[in-house]
Each structure stands twice: as structure tokens, then as C-alpha cells.
Interface confidence: medium
């Protein structure tokens, strides 16, 4: 996983990573949907 997020606590880091993972999944689905629609 990426280390590129500033944080001062591991729990905050973990939460930011979870958000990042979620956004990647959502954006990935949207991209796949757009390709499908084409």
C-alpha cells in the first residue's frame, strides 16, 4: 500500500487508507461502467 498520506497516528492513517481504498473502488466501478456504456 502507499505511504503517501500525512498522519500523526496509526488509527488516523488506517482510516485514511480505508477512505482511499473505498474511493479507488468507487472510481474504478464508475470507470468500468463508462467503458461498458461505450
Amino acid at each position: 500500500h502507499s505511504d503517501g498520506i500525512f498522519t500523526d497516528s496509526y488509527s488516523r492513517y488506517r482510516k485514511q487508507m480505508a477512505v482511499k481504498k473505498y474511493l479507488a473502488a468507487v472510481l474504478g466501478k464508475r470507470y468500468k461502467q463508462r467503458v461498458k456504456n461505450k
Epitope: 500500500h1 502507499s2 505511504d3 503517501g4 498522519t7 497516528s9 496509526y10 488509527s11 492513517y13 488506517r14 482510516k15 487508507m17 480505508a18 481504498k21
Partner: antibody, heavy 121, light 111 residues
């Protein structure tokens, strides 16, 4: 097979320094966050330090902050703990542990056998 | 810091009987629907061994007589049918807030 082997423990005088090492094998070391956990004789477990897979971020409890430094060399599959200004209360078995990949839950799924640090004059 | 209080300190259970260990946190260890509570088993002279993560998920290779439950501040580790090899000290650990903290341990013995 995942293996973690600690070394570098020993007897040191109060105020002295020691560097612990942990050799990792059997997994993609750079993909995992790693920790050090210690256990004083006859006592429970205490978290000492954590480092991210790429080594960019580190965390410590107040009890060791400013005295201990966790680091890693991913090219050598090795984890380190530099311990300075050692105190009698730092006497413990020090374990190297791998964090699970489960959404950074903080659980540690593989542990080494530990290395003993004794701080005494 | 989040303080984890385990009870009882020690427990003697007959072979085949149920063993229940409690872990109470001084504040919630939940975040976004997940509980950041872990359970470990430690036998004499050995390092801790991961049993359960995220309060109720059994780690791979752990017998299903072990189970975890709870959320918020109250958690339980249950051994449904105690076996001789389960004699050990059991620790809970939270990782929702820094610093990560462990409970004081519960020693499980055979009655």
C-alpha cells in the same frame, strides 16, 4: 513459511544503547507494516513501535518516544529498533511482529521468538 | 489511553467445558462499523499467537472452538470446549486509538 528472527538483545547499563534487528522471510516484506512489542519478565504485553511498509511513517507510545527509533531496510528484509537512554523498566523480551493485511486493523499475525534486553548496572 | 480490563485474571475449567474471558475498554474501540479488538493466546516460553481480529474474525488455522464477540467497549473470547492444548494466557488488544494497548491477560488452566 513466514519467519521472523530477532537478534541484538543483551545486557546493557542504564543510559546505554542497543540496536535490535529482525530478519524477515517467507513474505513480501515491503507490503506489510511491522511492529515491536515487548514483555517485561512475568508481565503483560506492551506495544513499542510501528512502521509502515514503505518506512515513511512511524508511531510510538509516550513511554519510548524520543528514545527508541523503529526503521526498516526493505532491500534486506530487515526491521530494526534503535534503543537509546535505556532504563531499568525497558528490561523485557522484545518481539518483532507483522501486521495483518486486513484493512490495517492493527492485529499482528506473525511473531518472532523474541530477544531479551536486560538493563542493569 | 484506552485501558483494557480483562476478567477474570485466571480461570480453571474442566476439559470439554466452556471458558469465557471478558475484556472491557475504557472507551469505544469501534470505528465506522468495525471493532478494532484483537485476541491473542500465549503459551509459556512462546510468543503470542493471533486468534481473533476485528472482534469476531477467526484467524486462519485457528480451531472453531474459539470465537469472539462484542462491540463498543465490551468484548468476549469464548472457548466452547476446552482442550488440554488451550492452557495459556489470553490477551485482548485494541488498535482503534494510539497508543495500542493490551489487557492484563487471563490465565486459563484445567480444573
Amino acid at each position: 513459511e513466514v519467519q521472523l528472527v530477532e537478534s541484538g538483545g543483551g545486557l546493557v547499563k542504564p543510559g546505554g544503547s542497543l540496536r535490535l534487528s529482525c530478519a524477515a522471510s517467507g513474505f513480501a516484506f515491503n507490503n506489510y507494516d511491522m511492529s515491536w512489542v515487548r514483555q517485561a519478565p512475568g508481565k503483560g504485553l506492551e506495544w513499542v513501535a510501528t512502521i509502515t511498509g514503505g518506512g515513511s511513517y512511524t508511531w510510538y507510545p509516550d513511554s519510548v518516544k524520543g528514545r527508541f527509533t523503529i526503521s526498516r531496510d526493505n532491500a534486506k528484509n530487515s526491521l530494526y529498533l534503535q534503543m537509546n537512554s535505556l532504563r531499568a523498566e525497558d528490561t523485557a523480551v522484545y518481539y518483532c511482529a507483522r501486521l495483518t493485511g486486513y484493512d490495517q486493523a492493527g492485529a499482528m499475525d506473525y511473531w518472532g521468538q523474541g530477544t531479551t534486553v536486560t538493563v542493569s548496572s | 489511553d484506552i485501558v483494557l480490563t480483562q476478567s477474570p485474571d485466571s480461570l480453571a475449567v474442566s476439559l470439554g467445558e466452556r471458558a469465557t474471558i471478558n475484556c472491557k475498554a475504557s472507551q469505544s474501540v469501534d470505528y465506522d462499523g468495525d471493532s478494532y479488538m484483537t485476541w491473542y493466546q500465549q503459551k509459556p516460553g512462546q510468543p503470542p499467537k493471533l486468534l481473533i481480529y476485528a472482534a469476531s474474525n477467526l484467524d486462519s488455522g485457528i480451531p472453531d472452538r474459539f470465537s469472539g464477540s462484542g462491540s463498543g467497549t465490551d468484548f468476549t473470547l469464548t472457548i466452547s470446549s476446552l482442550q488440554a492444548e488451550d492452557v495459556a494466557v489470553y490477551y485482548c488488544q485494541q488498535s482503534n486509538e494510539d497508543p495500542w494497548t493490551f489487557g492484563g491477560g487471563t490465565k486459563v488452566e484445567i480444573k
